[in-house]
């Protein structure tokens, strides 16, 4: 969008004629005070749209902001629309006026607003006041907004000189709301009821001297009416209350109950509505997907969370390998079921620092006089991997090994990298699995160990090096779903003595490296 | 500056009518509820109508309904109390004020008072 | 509608005195309670809103409280402007009604 003059702010003379142009790369329309304007709409041939808005005979009134936007604004971006200021000084205009809505202020917490007093020239000193206050309130003032902060519960004016002539803009009431109230609500006791038991409703109409109250439910429909008890709150500001109560409800008493409030002196009306559900007998659904395999991380705390609906309220036991779990003194597990709507409970089981005997088979169970249900899963503790080892020996028989042993859960994954040419090596190895090596260089074998009282994997990989002709960084990484670890050796070949091997320095261990190819290794697997 | 002014008030038959008026200067009339008081001489305030910005919620004190018409020209900040049917009780100093009463919060009216009242217009019904 | 008892309906009262006026609603009216102050041959004038509040330019000397069904007008200290006659109104829905007055005067 482009706007001509491009503002963002215009200073324009009383009485005068002024064009603002706006164009765009599809239909474009200028509005104020969220309506349009009365403008001229063109398309040119190369396809851009503009719009031509004449302000004439401007007045002081004409202050204000105006707006550029696409015509069909749904879903644009900010950018999709400009803002342009317009000033008109006018001395016959004082404060530009203000509706109801901007005089009344209401908070409902302490945050910054804005008392909206606008003046016609930004040339002009505005002055903030308490309301019949003398003394100029240290608050900043934009032209274009008028003065923001945080101010208490009064009532302010703003106050500004034109000419010889002091003027006063309306009073704004700042007003701190406590709480926000409503003319008429309708609760109930409970929305859902089992045959038999009772329904009671409650209409509550606020800040109204004469009403009559009508209730329209589902029995009445059939002609058979109840009578309602209307009655007073005393405690609290002119609340007036009816009650609809009816015993014993039947199925045939699920569905829609209205009040409809009619205010008799001025025939003002309101109502509200609530829906019932008789239900045959109680129940217990489950909402939403449990995995049956669940994760917690070792140490860490873990949460595992069931969401049921019930009526009546039922019963909740949780079980570990089928012994029933209670909050333990220690404070390593936490139980707790909430009531989040009137029929939908949350029950959750807090893992505080899991610990790897708290893997096992888990059971919810809900329940009470006419239905249960029950949820299990497994939880697995994952362990993130170690490398507790990574060693280089050089057997008899003339080939170099390199062997690394970790551990963690699920099973680690490990992956051999290595560089050879030290001085240019990058520090960062970028891993690769390897395979499909044909040449007898080298040979990898890994095992896998499961144990069981720790419930974790161990990983034991040897790499047998045959020709290490030149030092040689090798890199053991172990990889699982909740982490990584790795080590590095050096492998220096037999022909160098003992002490050369201790002194490679930090230097050598630049230089190319790679990951150990067709030509350096060959691997296998044993499972 | 901001200021009411009634007028129109004067001595008047049982059962005819007279209509007063209320020029407002020195706010933005439009934007606030506007209320009647009367004053029986030596006697205590009694709110006899009042109404929102637009004319849209008109309200009445039960004893002069039917009778007695508030109304309001935003243009002309004009506010206006058309009575008919007059009797002898609804003798009394006619004030208008204005009225804050904030836009609903919820569906609900909070008031801040009658802050602003003119000095009052006498209406004598008399045979 | 709703009733507005106050009283007394004349105190008198000396320059430097504490004066309490009292109002009581017929029924709860919560906080929606003003209070105004009107010299003779003038109009009245705004003294408290919602029970508590004090409007902007009235000395502090004036002030209010209660809700529900019960409140108070309190000047701290009397001063020779101050003798007049005072009217409680409360709001209630859309209708508004006023307090009979308390004529304060001079002991």
């Known amino acids: 969008l482009v706007i001509t003059p491009p503002g963002p702010e215009l200073i324009l003379n009383v009485s005068s004629t002024f064009v603002l142009t706006c164009s765009g790369s599809a239909p474009v329309v200028w509005e104020r005070m969220s309506q349009e304007l009365p403008q001229e709409m063109a398309k040119a041939q190369d396809n851009t749209f503009s719009s031509v808005l004449t302000l004439t005979n401007l007045t002081g009134l004409d202050t204000g902001e105006y707006f550029c936007t696409y015509n069909d604004s749904r879903g644009l971006e900010p950018d999709e629309r400009k803002r342009l200021y317009i000033f008109v000084p006018d001395p016959t205009v004082g404060f530009l006026p203000n509706d109801a809505e901007e005089l009344f202020i209401f908070l409902t917490e302490i945050t910054e607003i804005t008392i909206p007093c606008r003046v016609t020239d930004p040339q002009l000193v505005v002055t903030l006041h308490e309301k019949k206050g003398d003394i100029a309130l240290p608050v900043p003032y934009d032209h274009q907004r008028g003065f923001s902060g945080i101010f208490e519960d009064r009532s302010y004016i703003c106050k500004t000189t034109i000419g010889d002539r002091e003027v006063d803009s309306d009073a704004y009431y700042v007003y701190r709301l406590q709480v926000s109230s409503i003319n008429v609500s309708v609760n109930a006791v409970q929305t859902v009821v089992r045959q038999g038991e009772n329904i009671t409703l409650m209409c509550i109409v606020i800040g109204n001297e004469v009403v009559n109250f009508e209730w329209m439910y589902p029995r009445k429909e059939s002609g058979r009416l109840v009578e309602p008890v209307t009655d007073f709150l005393l405690d609290m500001p002119y609340h007036i209350r009816s009650i609809l109560h009816i015993p014993s409800a039947e199925l045939e008493d699920s569905g829609t109950y209205t009040c409809n409030v009619t205010e008799s002196v001025n025939d003002h009306q309101d109502e509200k509505a609530i829906n019932i559900t008789v239900v045959e007998s109680g129940y217990v659904r489950l909402l939403g997907e449990v995995g049956a395999l669940q994760f917690a991380e070792l140490h860490r705390s873990r949460t595992l969370q069931v969401v049921f609906e019930a009526y009546p309220p039922p019963t909740v036991l949780w079980f570990k390998d089928n012994r029933t779990l209670g909050d333990s003194s220690a404070g390593e597990i936490a139980l707790s079921t909430r009531n989040v709507s009137e029929t939908r409970y949350v029950s959750e089981l807090t893992l505080v620092r899991v610990k790897v005997a708290e893997a096992g088979h888990y059971t919810m169970r809900a329940f009470h006089e006419d239905a249960e249900v029950q949820l299990s899963f497994q939880l697995q503790i994952n362990v993130p991997v170690r490398v507790l080892e990574l060693s280089e020996s050089h057997p008899d028989s003339g080939e170099q090994t390199v062997r690394c042993r970790g551990r963690g859960m699920p099973q680690p994954n490990i992956i051999w990298s290595a560089c050879r040419d030290l001085k240019r090596c990058p520090r960062e190895l970028p891993p690769m699995l390897l395979g499909n090596s044909s040449e007898e260089e080298s040979q990898l074998e890994t095992n896998v160990t499961y144990w069981e009282e720790e419930q974790e994997f161990e990983v034991v990989s040897t790499l047998r090096l045959q020709h290490v002709d030149r030092p040689l960084s090798v890199r053991c990484t172990l990889r699982n779903a909740v982490g990584q670890d790795m080590q590095e050796v050096i492998v220096v070949p037999h022909s160098l003595p003992f002490k050369e091997q201790k002194l490679i320095s930090e230097e050598d261990l630049g230089g190319e490296q790679k990951l150990i190819s067709e030509e350096d290794l060959h691997h296998h697997h044993h499972h | 500056q901001v200021q009411l002014v009634e007028s129109g008030g004067g001595l008047v038959q049982p059962g005819g009518s007279l209509r007063l008026s209320c020029a407002a200067s020195?706010?933005?009339?439009?934007?606030?509820?506007m209320s009647w008081v009367r004053q029986v001489p030596g006697k205590g305030l009694e709110w006899v109508a009042n109404?929102?910005?637009?004319?849209?919620?008109?309200y009445y004190v039960d004893s002069v309904k039917g009778r007695l018409t508030i109304s309001r020209e935003n243009v002309k900040n004009s506010l206006y109390l058309q009575m008919n049917g007059l009797r002898a009780e609804d003798t009394a100093v006619y004030y208008c004020?204005?009225?804050?009463?904030?836009?609903?919060?919820?569906?609900?009216?909070?008031?801040?008072?009658?802050?602003?009242w003119g000095h009052g217009t006498m209406v004598t019904v008399s045979s | 509608a709703i009733q507005m008892t106050q009283s007394p309906s004349t105190l008198s009262a000396s320059v430097g005195d504490i004066v309490t006026i009292t109002c009581r609603a017929s029924?709860?009216?919560?906080?929606?309670l003003a209070w105004y102050q009107q010299k003779p041959g003038k109009a009245p004038k705004l003294l408290i809103f919602k029970a508590s509040s004090l409007e902007s330019g009235v000395p502090s000397r004036f002030s209010g409280s209660g809700s529900g069904t019960d409140f108070t007008l309190t000047i701290s200290s009397l001063q020779p402007d101050d003798f007049a006659t005072y009217y409680c109104q409360q709001y209630n829905s859309y209708s508004r009604t006023f307090g009979q007055g308390t004529k304060v005067d001079i002991k």
């Open positions: 020195g706010f933005t009339f439009s934007s606030y509820w």
């Open positions: 004020a204005r009225d804050l009463v904030p836009p609903r919060q919820g569906d609900y009216y909070y008031y801040f008072g009658m802050d602003v």
């Open positions: 029924q709860s009216i919560s906080d929606w």
């Open positions: 109404m929102n910005q637009d004319g849209t919620e008109k």
